[in-house]
């Protein structure tokens, strides 16, 4: 056997090159036939009407033909015939790769609630061979379940991903990425998750700045509530007691002027949205006012200030205990 061919793999729409090569040429006739055994070329003559076949080279040692705009129907065995004694026949198989026609991602719900499990489907339509679908949530790969449907030598792959969503997933892309021999680089489609979650409540003490609350001082607390949708209700209550008469509520802020020991207690900021309710507690402890010392005869402002500060710390045994002022989130 001195007639040789090579199998060809080509992407749909591109060009396939079929070559019939003769090792030891004796000027025998070379003929190329299609899978229906119709003659494409007899030597350098093409009787077949399909003008997508063009002669690239014809000699006693090679018949080389190009097939442009390859379609799936061109797939199959192409026969090279060499009329030696005895006649020789060799075949080349053309395999046509078809990239997925369409890539569609479908999320069961446009908006999900934290803790909920949602279904995400991705469909890669009409490819050959079947497409491999990979899932990513942000940069994290997830495992889906694929189903393959075959129709007329083409494959439609649908991959299902069951995803339990958390608040951190809000705004994160869910990516459907396909891997296919006819696709170079990344072919992917994505949808951004929209996750609703109950508020997260955090209390910030905006006054006094150094964090110590003393009798006669003022207190200002700000309640920060973040949720999706943004909380509609932010309220302040005093746990197990009435709110002091001199307390002032203004939106997310709580003001208490002229603190006294009776103001000690737990102050709660509550926030809610359509998903749920949450709160955070602030335990107020009002310290004694600082001990004052009569000013010395020679006044050095800087020294006095320094001395006062030192004396205060020494005098008030609880002055440094930050643990007595705490906010508890729930």
């Amino acid at each position: 056997q001195n007639l040789f061919t090579k199998d060809v793999t080509v992407i749909e729409g591109e060009v396939a090159t079929i070559s019939c090569q003769v090792n030891k040429s004796d000027d025998s006739v070379i003929q190329l036939l299609n899978p229906n055994r119709q003659t494409i070329y007899f030597r350098d003559f093409r009787p077949l009407k399909d003008s997508r076949f063009q002669l690239l080279n014809f000699s006693s040692s090679e018949l080389k033909v190009s097939l442009t705009n390859v379609s799936i129907s061109d797939e199959g065995r192409y026969f090279c015939q060499l009329y030696t004694d005895p006649p020789q026949e060799s075949y080349t198989t053309i395999t046509v790769l078809v990239p997925p026609r369409n890539l569609m991602i479908d999320i069961q719900k446009d908006t999900a609630v934290e803790g909920e499990e949602i279904e995400v489907n991705c469909t890669a339509m009409a490819s050959k061979p079947a497409t491999t679908i990979r899932w990513f949530k942000g940069n994290t790969e997830l495992k889906g379940k694929s189903e393959v449907e075959e129709w007329s030598d083409m494959y439609t792959v649908t991959s299902q991903l069951m995803l339990k969503v958390h608040k951190e997933d809000d705004g994160v892309p869910v990516i459907c990425q396909v891997e296919h021999p006819a696709v170079t680089g990344n072919l992917q489609t994505q949808r951004y998750l929209e996750v609703q979650y109950k508020p997260q409540v955090h209390i910030q003490m905006t006054y006094p700045l150094q964090g110590l609350t003393r009798e006669g001082d003022a207190l200002e607390l700000t309640c920060e509530a973040i949720g999706k949708p943004q909380p509609v209700m932010v309220t302040w209550v005093r746990v197990d007691d009435e709110m002091p008469q001199h307390a002032v509520l203004s939106g997310p802020n709580l003001f208490i002027n002229n603190l006294n020991k009776t103001d000690n207690g737990t102050y709660r900021c509550e926030a809610s949205n359509i998903v749920g309710k949450a709160h955070s507690d602030y335990m107020l402890y009002v310290y004694d006012p600082p001990t004052t010392i009569p000013p010395p005869t020679t006044t050095t402002t800087t020294t006095t200030t320094t001395t006062t500060t030192i004396l205060t710390i020494i005098t008030d045994s609880r002055a440094g205990e930050e643990g007595s002022i705490r906010a508890v989130d729930h």
């Epitope: 000027d27 025998s28 006739v29 003929q31 119709q38 003659t39 007899f42 030597r43 003559f45 093409r46 009787p47 077949l48 009407k49 399909d50 003008s51 009329y83 030696t84 004694d85 005895p86 006649p87």
Partner: antibody, heavy 121, light 107 residues
């Protein structure tokens, strides 16, 4: 210059065998890129292909369905010619008989001048 | 009955263009060949393959093909083009078939 020349009797009796020869000059009957054909023409049937012989490392014959059971085409390499035998002829076989060279098995690029054969008693 | 169909007769004024057609299922796959035959003479190949002319055939002869129809066009017909024209291809079994012929008259 390639030439083809038909020869044979111009009159054949019904039920007998029609025999014709085509002499080739300027080409070889054993050419591996040609086929050698017999075609006939009559007013009632127009041009009608009868069959071919060709060499592609071995000899091949193709015959028209209409005459398959009673036709033989043979090459004669020693005389560089090919022949037609048509058995059991009837007046319907009366026609001008042409030998023709075919490129591959695709088109007739050269014809003989033709010979009229009449089938009559 | 022939598997290639041609109009029996076509006429053309001298110097004008004429198209002779040939129809058949096999022409969807294969090109037709065209032959010119003058009275008392053997047929002569004028067009083969996609649109190939053997040497000695004037360039006013051209061939084309679409679907199941092959056409022979003579652009600027001359008096000597008056003849019978036959198309040729193969049937579904691979047998050689000829059209019934078209008689071209040049007026």
């Amino acid at each position: 210059q390639v030439q083809l020349q038909e020869s044979g009797p111009g009159l054949v009796k019904p039920s007998q065998t029609l025999s014709l020869t085509c002499a080739i000059s300027g080409d070889s009957v054993s050419s591996n890129s040609a086929a050698w054909n017999w075609i006939r023409q009559s007013p009632s049937r127009g041009l009608e292909w009868l069959g071919r012989t060709y060499y592609r490392s071995k000899w091949y014959n193709d015959y028209a369905v209409s005459v398959k059971s009673r036709i033989t085409i043979n090459p004669d390499t020693s005389k560089n010619q090919f022949s037609l035998q048509l058995n059991s002829v009837t007046p319907e076989d009366t026609a001008v008989y042409y030998c023709a060279r075919e490129y591959g098995i695709w088109y007739f690029d050269l014809w003989g001048r033709g010979t009229l054969v009449t089938v009559s008693s | 009955s022939s598997e290639l169909t041609q109009d029996p007769a076509v006429s053309v004024a001298l110097g004008q263009t004429v198209r002779i057609t040939c129809q058949g299922d096999s022409l969807r796959s294969y090109y037709a060949s065209w032959y010119q035959q003058k009275p008392g003479q053997a047929p002569v190949l004028v067009i083969y393959g996609k649109n190939n002319r053997p040497s000695g055939i004037p360039d006013r002869f051209s061939g084309s093909s679409s679907g199941n129809t092959a056409s022979l066009t003579i652009t600027g017909a001359q008096a000597e083009d008056e003849a019978d024209y036959y198309c040729n291809s193969r049937d579904s079994s691979g047998n050689v078939v000829f059209g019934g012929g078209t008689k071209l008259t040049v007026l």
